[in-house]
């Protein structure tokens, strides 16, 4: 799996999970989240060469097409596979509220 | 939806469905499929600017992060959303066989 266990341990130019820390205020301009101040969002990036972690039949076909037709612009792309939620604390006036934001953290990637 | 109805009618640099015809023999080296000789596989390509058809909370966050940090390499990518199967005819010796290959045709795209 193209997850932290594999990607953060290996120097990998191909599609892999990349570390990305997002500071809510500085990076998103969000002042409404009280805690945490930021989080490890991560992201997916890298080349999708011939059959590298291909996701669907179509991405495998596209990967093969690209190998046989190297001048083609039609190639799979490195995107998130497994995502996890992030629990945040914010305030409505003086009242604290805990909320779970879905699909905020990327845990693994794929070529799709 | 970033489907044929929208994308094939509009000239669109952003993430959209692109037409792609694949000839099984010429483009994939597959001799075993008898019919069809090829098919409209399509593919997804184009830029994913701020909130352009963002798929998940993470891709929306990444899109916003990219707007505020334009030098960052972390940006969403244009990939397939809806896929459809393709029915093929092949031969086992002289005996014809019909098979449905799943996820072979891209019908729409998203930024993920």
């Amino acid at each position: 799996a193209l997850d932290a266990a594999y990607c953060f341990r290996n120097v990998q130019d191909n599609c892999c999970l990349r570390p990305l820390y997002i500071d809510f205020k500085r990076d998103l301009g969000w002042k409404w989240i009280h805690e945490p101040k930021g989080y490890n969002a991560n992201f997916c990036a890298g080349a999708c060469p011939y059959l590298w972690s291909s996701d669907t039949q179509h991405s495998r076909v596209l990967s093969l097409y690209n190998t046989i037709n190297p001048e083609a612009s039609a190639s799979p792309c490195c995107v998130s596979q497994d995502l996890e939620p992030l629990t945040i604390l914010y305030y409505i006036g003086k009242t604290p509220k805990i909320e779970q934001l879905s699909n905020m953290i990327v845990k693994s990637c794929k070529c799709s | 939806a970033l489907d044929a109805a929208y994308c094939f009618r509009n000239v669109q640099d952003n993430c959209c469905l692109r037409p792609l015809y694949i000839d099984f023999k010429r483009d994939l080296g597959w001799k075993w499929i008898h019919e069809p000789k090829g098919y409209n596989a399509n593919f997804c390509a184009g830029a994913c600017p701020y909130l352009w058809s963002s798929d998940t909370q993470h891709s929306r966050v990444l899109s916003l992060y990219n707007t505020i940090n334009p030098e960052a390499s972390a940006s969403p990518c244009c990939v397939s959303q809806d896929l459809e199967p393709l029915t093929i005819l092949y031969y086992i010796g002289k005996t014809p066989k019909i098979e449905q290959l799943s996820n072979m045709i891209v019908k729409s795209c998203k930024c993920s």
Epitope: Q57, L64, T67 | L28, G29, W32, I92, G93, K94
Partner: antibody
């Protein structure tokens, strides 16, 4: 050049399973069909089945249906043959071979063979 | 399943001789579903002929194949010492693929 490299010799007890790999290099693995054939002095060559990589369509000879599983891992260019419920009559040299392109076809490249001995 | 019968089961010939091996199918294969292989002791089979009459790449022109329906022939026009081997026919018109029992060719 085209190479099909198979796993080494194996000894198994009756009732057990064996899994042989066939790693391809030097050609586009996903464009060809991989057939599996075994050879014994008594029976000669027996075709077991074939697998189409990427789409994972497998075709089996009737006599092996139910105890033979053919798969292909496109990420490693490797085909696998698993034979279950082994009997002494399954002692043979097992070959993988790439076909000329069709599901049933002539076979132009062969692996070096894997000797499987079934003995208690 | 289709039975493939080869004849002769063995033969001995001299260098320069013309050698013919025949293969008979228990039912019609059409014109192009037959292959011939050469196997030397301890070696893997080598494809000689496919589609009944097409030579595989790199196969010397002294090897030729002919036939259709149920009767097929492999001919070696002028025997060379390195042609000592067992020759097999194979049909792929119907599942399962089946092979002949082999013809062992010895060089005198």
């Amino acid at each position: 050049q085209v190479l099909l490299v198979q796993s080494g010799a194996d000894v198994r007890k009756p009732g057990a399973s064996v899994k042989i790999f066939c790693k391809a290099s030097g050609y586009t693995f996903t464009s060809n069909v991989i057939s599996w054939v075994r050879q014994t002095p008594a029976q000669g060559f027996e075709w077991m089945g074939g697998v189409i990589p990427i789409v994972d369509i497998a075709n089996y000879a009737q006599r092996f249906k139910g105890r033979l599983v053919l798969t292909a891992d496109t990420s490693t260019n490797t085909a696998y043959m698993e034979l279950r419920s082994l009997k002494s009559a399954d002692t043979a040299v097992y070959y993988c071979a790439s076909t000329l392109g069709l599901v049933l076809d002539a076979m132009d490249y062969w692996g070096q063979g894997s000797l499987v001995t079934v003995s208690s | 399943e289709i039975q493939m019968t080869q004849s002769p089961s063995s033969l001995s010939a001299s260098p320069g001789d013309r050698v013919t091996i025949t293969c008979r199918a228990s039912q019609s294969l059409g014109s192009s579903y037959l292959a011939w292989y050469q196997q030397k002791p301890g070696k893997v089979p080598k494809l000689l002929i496919y589609g009944a009459s097409s030579r595989a790449p790199g196969v010397p022109s002294r090897f030729s194949g002919s036939g259709s329906g149920t009767d097929f022939t492999l001919t070696i026009s002028s025997l060379e010492p390195e042609d000592a081997a067992t020759y097999y026919c194979q049909q792929y018109a119907d599942s399962p693929i089946t092979f002949g029992q082999g013809t062992k060719l010895e060089i005198k």
